[in-house]
């Protein structure tokens, strides 16, 4: 069943029964409500596994990466795909399953002793390689979080936002990624015209903080499309 694929955790701290079957452990929503997704896609089934649309690896499960389902496919249509196991071909770290990373186009085991030196080298390699990604640009990398014992402070090298301390996100800076501050109200943010276009940025900004969204600055509405300034604004 879907749940057995997705979740192996026991139900803990269930709410008290309030009538119906809702209080019983493991009970699912009887009729799945329609859920609205960016782009207006609506799925109304619980029993059928539906691919999850994504813009970056961080949105997917721990054993998945975000990419176009067909090689050379439309970069705007991306879903979460199953990670690649050891010795399988890869184009970036996030494609490899936890405990592995992408080296010379192959998923290899993350050797704790040699890992840190090789990771920078591999990141640089993949950026310099024309065939480094499925869809023409690199995106957020993912590796086993056990590589990072403490949360990174601002400026620390990272692979994903969960490697960074609270209030920071993992964003590209030149050819590596570092922990940068999550954007505050009024700060300039990047509004991507198409999904995944953030992969083209050399100096990537974090997302807007809690309660904020990246919207066009009011006094820039008249400006041309290319010069529109977006800032983090209250919802």
């Amino acid at each position: 069943t879907l749940n057995s694929v997705l979740n192996s955790n026991a139900i803990k701290n269930l709410p008290p029964p309030l009538g119906g079957a809702a209080g019983h452990p493991g009970s699912a929503v009887s009729a799945a409500p329609g859920i609205l997704y960016p782009g207006g896609n609506k799925y109304q089934t619980i029993d059928n596994y539906q691919p999850y649309p994504c813009a970056e690896d961080e949105e997917c499960g721990t054993d998945e990466y975000c990419a176009s389902p067909t090689r050379g496919g439309d970069a705007g249509v991306q879903i979460c795909l199953a990670c690649r196991k050891r010795r399988k071909r890869c184009m970036r770290h996030a494609m490899c399953c936890p405990g592995n990373y992408c080296k010379n186009g192959i998923c290899v085991s993350s050797d704790q002793n040699h890992f840190r030196g090789e990771i920078e080298e591999t990141i640089t390699e993949s950026f310099g390689n024309d065939h480094s990604t499925l869809d023409g640009y690199s995106r957020r990398t993912t590796l086993s979080s056990k590589m990072y014992h403490t949360k990174g402070q601002e400026g620390s090298v990272c692979l994903r936002s969960s490697d960074c301390a609270s209030g920071l996100c993992c964003a590209r800076h030149f050819w590596s990624k570092i922990c940068k501050p999550v954007l505050k109200e009024g700060q300039v943010c990047t509004k991507h015209r198409r999904k995944g276009s953030h992969g083209l940025e050399i100096f990537q900004r974090c997302y807007c903080g809690e309660g904020l969204s990246c919207r066009i600055q009011k006094d820039h509405h008249q400006a041309s499309n290319s010069s529109r300034l977006h800032t983090c604004q209250r919802h």
């Epitope: 879907l2 749940n3 694929v5 997705l6 979740n7 955790n9 026991a10 139900i11 803990k12 701290n13 809702a22 452990p25 493991g26 009970s27 699912a28 929503v29 799945a32 409500p33 859920i35 997704y37 799925y43 089934t45 619980i46 596994y49 539906q50 691919p51 999850y52 649309p53 813009a55 970056e56 961080e58 949105e59 997917c60 499960g61 721990t62 054993d63 998945e64 979460c80 199953a82 936002s161 969960s162 609270s166 997302y207 809690e210």
Partner: nanobody, 129 residues
């Protein structure tokens, strides 16, 4: 001990607004989806809204889309549900819940209550006509 505690419920007139808050203690939930469910007397628990582990993704039931907004502040271990244009049919006990980031995620992951492994005790929301 891990706890999720909801607050902000109460009695409000139709068309009014309420802001529910869910505060986690005992651990952080950075790598969890945080969801809101509700249950009216004699009815089954139903999905309302969720925000994923990657802060940018929110999901809503059709019945609340455009009226409810969920957000989270990992630094404060808090999740919010801003409810506006409330209707009498929104009357229910509202629960906050946490679902771990799974190995594989599907479109229905966030609305499936059995994927959530931590639950609060709920807060009553009553909308009078």
């Amino acid at each position: 001990e891990v706890q999720l505690v909801e607050s902000g419920g109460g009695l409000v007139q139709a068309g009014g607004s309420l802001r529910l808050s869910c505060t986690a203690s005992g651990r952080t939930f950075d790598n969890h989806a945080m969801g809101w469910f509700r249950q009216a007397p004699g009815k089954e628990r139903e999905f309302v809204a969720a925000i994923s582990w990657s802060l940018s993704r929110t999901h809503y039931a059709d019945s609340v889309s455009g009226r409810f907004t969920t957000s989270r502040d990992n630094a404060k271990n808090t999740v919010l549900l801003q409810m506006s244009s409330l209707k009498p049919e929104d009357t229910a006990v509202y629960y906050c819940a946490a679902a771990p980031r799974p190995k594989r995620v599907s479109v229905s992951y966030f609305s499936t209550s059995s994927n959530y492994d931590y639950w609060g005790q709920g807060t009553q929301v009553t909308v009078s006509s």
